[in-house]
């Protein structure tokens, strides 16, 4: 049993080494962003036992706009490109350490999740105030407008392909 | 296929300076999401740094931000990593990652060999 790609959080990217059950990944934030104080990066693969389905937990993280760095808007392509950021006090919860993952459950549903079709696109994720879209002007890989900048990172033990059609890549973008 | 060679590792005292290099060959550079992972002994690899493919975002661990740099010479088909103010906990294996960006499947990661970073205190 494997998860899906993991739901977009706003603002952040995600690598994901692996699919498999009870693994944990982390979200990190886009430049210009900080996770704020009291979130947690950690998502993590869990079973849900009702459907026997395997998802991801909700990460509580939210990446702030960091006022102590410089924000660079998305460079055009060139031949070099530098994003840089200036030095700034780690956000951090009161213990000094980040919280964990909210801890995995088995009546998460799909709802909390991404919605995945083969063959498609990862879905966008919604907000659990609204129910809204949250929309991101932050540039894909692909030079659009995207839903987030979260893509997935498949960690493999060489450089040889994985199977196709194992799992869907995880984009978040939208077009 | 892709292959990916780093280089700039090194032993350095804390508060110095390190850059690291990754020279990718094997598939049309400026189509490739690269990204920096380390790997402290005993722990797991961590994502450090990436880049999409037109180096229009970028994105950095927490304990990494300010610090570190990324940047990509899509005409040198490289991709730095400029580390400073560097501290011991920033000692592990560094190493350089790239993928085709694909909205519709899986694509492999492919791994550079990694290149050793040790901070003295």
């Known amino acids: 049993i494997t998860c899906p790609p993991p739901m977009s959080v706003e603002h952040a990217d995600i690598w994901v080494k692996s699919y498999s059950l009870y693994s944990r990944e982390r979200y990190i934030c886009n430049s210009g962003f900080k996770r704020k104080a009291g979130t947690s990066s950690l998502t993590e693969c869990v079973l849900n036992k009702a459907t026997n389905v395997a998802h991801w937990t909700t990460p509580s993280l939210k990446c702030i706009r960091d006022p102590a760095l410089v924000h660079q808007r998305p460079a055009p392509p060139s031949t070099v490109t530098t994003a840089g950021v200036t030095p700034q006090p780690e956000s951090l919860s009161p213990s000094g350490k980040e919280p964990a993952a909210s801890s995995p459950s088995s009546n998460n549903t799909a709802a909390t999740t991404a919605a995945i079709v083969p063959g498609s696109q990862l879905m966008p994720s919604k907000s659990p105030s609204t129910g809204t879209t949250e929309i991101s002007s932050h540039e894909s890989s692909h030079g659009t407008p995207s839903q987030t900048t979260a893509k997935n990172w498949e960690l493999t033990a060489s450089a040889s392909h994985q199977p196709p059609g194992v799992y869907p890549q995880g984009h978040s973008d939208t077009t | 296929e892709v292959q990916l060679v780093e280089s700039g590792g090194g032993l350095v005292q804390a508060g110095g300076s390190l850059r690291l290099s990754c020279a990718a060959s094997?598939?049309?550079?400026?189509?490739?999401?690269m990204a920096w992972f380390r790997q402290a002994p005993g722990k797991e690899r961590d994502t450090v740094a990436s880049?999409?493919?037109?180096?229009?975002?970028?994105s950095y661990t927490d304990s990494v931000q300010g610090r570190f740099t990324i940047s990509r010479d899509n005409a040198k088909n490289t991709v730095y990593l400029q580390m400073n103010s560097l501290k011991p906990e920033d000692t592990a294996v560094y190493y350089c990652?790239?993928?085709?960006?694909?909205?519709?499947?899986?694509?492999?990661?492919?791994w550079g060999q990694g290149t050793q970073v040790t901070v003295s205190s």
């Open positions: 880049i999409n493919s037109s180096g229009g975002t970028t």
């Open positions: 094997g598939r049309t550079f400026s189509s490739l999401d």
């Open positions: 990652a790239a993928r085709v960006p694909s909205a519709v499947s899986a694509t492999p990661i492919y």
